[in-house]
């Protein structure tokens, strides 16, 4: 039997093209060298090689770069950042923006990977900070990276980068994330009249304290009940009968279909029935005629 | 010489999961590719996949998620991890070295160990 | 994905006779397929690689042609030994595929 570790005669690769589909995966290693395959990276996703030799080629560049791969090998991975492991990439130093997105553009459309959880990881951490340029590129690849974050990571978001955030970008976003997120959206959109300020502030009222809920009754907004449906339930509570009403507009008729579920339930057992019934709507559950409502938490307070 | 010799094999109920091993002598692993192959009774040999010199793994797409193979180079064994066994799982199955020193998958696989029967019944 | 498919399933052959067995790969594999020879209760034995070169110690009656996606096994004098299942494998992509191998053509005697 040959040997096969040696490059055969003649078969020493002198750039990285088509003809070499058909080396076999020793030949690959024996005959492309690493840092020709290093500088024309850039061929290797042009040309059909096999799951096995890209593995092949992998190998090559790892044991090029042992402390991982310079950003000049990176951005031209393509295809190649598949086959790259949460620890091949916890040893990149990824600072451009382009770089990053090339590599998004490779995972299109699939779920966020842990390859590219941990690249995205490595990009911030990188830039101390969420800026509004990376937000709107890794939100526009991935609707629901927002929501992937720690509230102590969404802490590092500024304000101005808000404005890059849809609607949709927060649908999987839960209570804590909003309660970070709503101060810095209240800040970034605060010169907006009261119109345009609501509709950019809607998505993020799942964290928004009930005096900012009250502000928001007072300017005849007509937030819609799936929105109202996910306001926290401790900032609910407090209004009244009234301040829902002006705070729904129009949409006040559909907290009957929601009677059942919070937060519209526990607002209810908190309201006076004689309130629930100027609404016309037959909502039941509320506090009977002559009942006394004595706030606890006031009393502990003050003991 | 180079030897292969599986173990591991037996009977197993549907849902259960059992580890075969390849125990081998006369060469090194961190220098060839080693493979699985299964045959039923009577049936065609079924290629399951294989593990490179470097350790990537390579598997049939109905073997993937199911079975795992790995190796122990200190120890000069591979094994071959089975999941979720059905029925249709019973088999003969065998290790086999990749035929060529270059540690992948490129001219076949030689030689091949005699064997394991491995049964799936209630 | 990737295919073989071998023909005939099943032959009836006198010794002396001139064996031909036909494997085709469902795309272009150039010249990675390697061919093997099985007997009842025993492993496969490693016959031909790369689609033509003789692996040590087979016989030189045993020969392989063919290159892209059709290849031939060619027996040119069956011996008695020679009655066995043939199976034929493509190398060039053995991940994700359903499986690398034809499914034999079993030569029996006439």
């Known amino acids: 039997e040959v040997e096969k570790t040696a490059c055969p005669s003649g078969k020493k690769a002198r750039e990285i093209d088509e003809s070499l589909i058909f080396y076999k995966k020793w030949e690959l290693e024996a005959c492309v060298d690493a840092a020709l395959l290093a500088t024309q990276m850039d061929r290797v996703n042009a040309i059909p090689f096999t799951y096995e030799q890209l593995d092949v080629l992998k190998h090559k560049l790892d044991e090029l770069y042992p402390q991982g791969y310079p950003e000049s090998v990176i951005q031209h991975l393509g295809y190649l950042f598949l086959k790259m492991s949460p620890e091949d990439i916890r040893k990149w130093n990824v600072t451009s923006l382009e770089t990053l997105k090339a590599l998004l553009e490779v995972n299109k459309g699939h779920e966020m990977s842990p390859q590219v959880a941990t690249l995205i990881d490595r990009f911030v951490k990188g830039r101390g900070q969420l800026d509004k340029d990376t937000l709107d590129t890794l939100t526009a690849f991935y609707p629901g990276y927002l929501c992937s974050l720690s509230p102590e990571e969404l802490s590092s978001v500024p304000p101005s980068s808000i404005w890059a955030v849809r609607p949709q970008d927060l649908d999987t976003c839960d209570p804590r994330q909003l309660d970070v997120l709503y101060p810095k959206a209240r800040l970034a959109f605060q010169n907006m009249n009261g119109s345009e300020y609501f509709v950019k502030i809607q998505s993020f009222l799942g964290g928004a304290p009930t005096e900012d809920l009250k502000a928001l009754s007072q300017q005849n907004v007509s937030m819609d009940l799936a929105t109202f449906m996910k306001l926290r339930t401790d900032a609910v509570l407090p209004l009244t009968v009234a301040e829902v009403q002006k705070l729904l507009g129009p949409h006040v008729e559909g907290l009957k279909a929601e009677e059942r579920h919070r937060p519209v339930r526990d607002w209810i057992l908190r309201q006076r029935q004689d309130d629930l019934d100027t609404l016309g709507l037959g909502l039941q559950g509320g506090i009977p005629n002559g009942y006394l409502v004595l706030d606890l938490s006031m009393q502990e307070a003050l003991s | 010489q180079s030897q292969l010799v599986e173990s591991g094999g037996g009977l197993v109920q549907p849902g259960g999961s059992l580890r075969l091993s390849c125990a081998v002598s006369?060469?090194?692993?961190?220098?060839?590719?080693m493979g699985w192959v299964r045959q039923a009774p009577g049936k065609c040999l079924e290629y399951i996949g294989y593990?490179?010199?470097?350790?990537?793994?390579y598997y049939a797409s109905w073997a993937k998620g199911r079975f795992t193979i790995s190796k122990d180079n200190s120890k000069n064994t591979v094994y071959l991890q089975m999941n979720s066994l059905r029925a249709e799982d019973t088999a003969v199955y065998f290790c086999?070295?990749?035929?060529?020193?270059?540690?992948?998958?490129?001219?076949?696989?030689?030689?091949w160990g005699q064997g394991t029967l491995v049964t799936v019944s209630s | 994905a990737l295919q073989m498919t071998q023909s005939p399933s099943s032959l009836s052959a006198r010794v002396g006779d001139r064996v031909t067995i036909k494997c085709q790969a469902s795309?272009?594999?150039?010249?990675?397929l390697a061919w093997y020879q099985q007997k009842p209760g025993k492993p496969p034995k490693f016959l031909i690689y790369d689609a033509s070169d003789l692996a040590s110690g087979v016989p030189s009656r045993f020969s392989g042609s063919g290159s892209g996606r059709d290849f031939t096994l060619t027996i040119s004098s069956l011996q008695p030994e020679d009655f066995a299942t043939y199976y034929c494998?493509?190398?060039?992509?053995?991940?994700?595929?359903?499986?690398?191998f034809g499914c034999g053509t079993k030569v029996t005697v006439l």
């Open positions: 795309q272009s594999i150039s010249n990675y």
């Open positions: 006369g060469f090194s692993l961190s220098s060839y590719a």
């Open positions: 593990i490179s010199k470097i350790g990537t793994t």
């Open positions: 086999a070295r990749g035929s060529s020193s270059g540690g992948y998958l490129d001219d076949g696989f030689d030689p």
């Open positions: 494998q493509q190398v060039y992509d053995s991940n994700n595929v359903e499986n690398v």
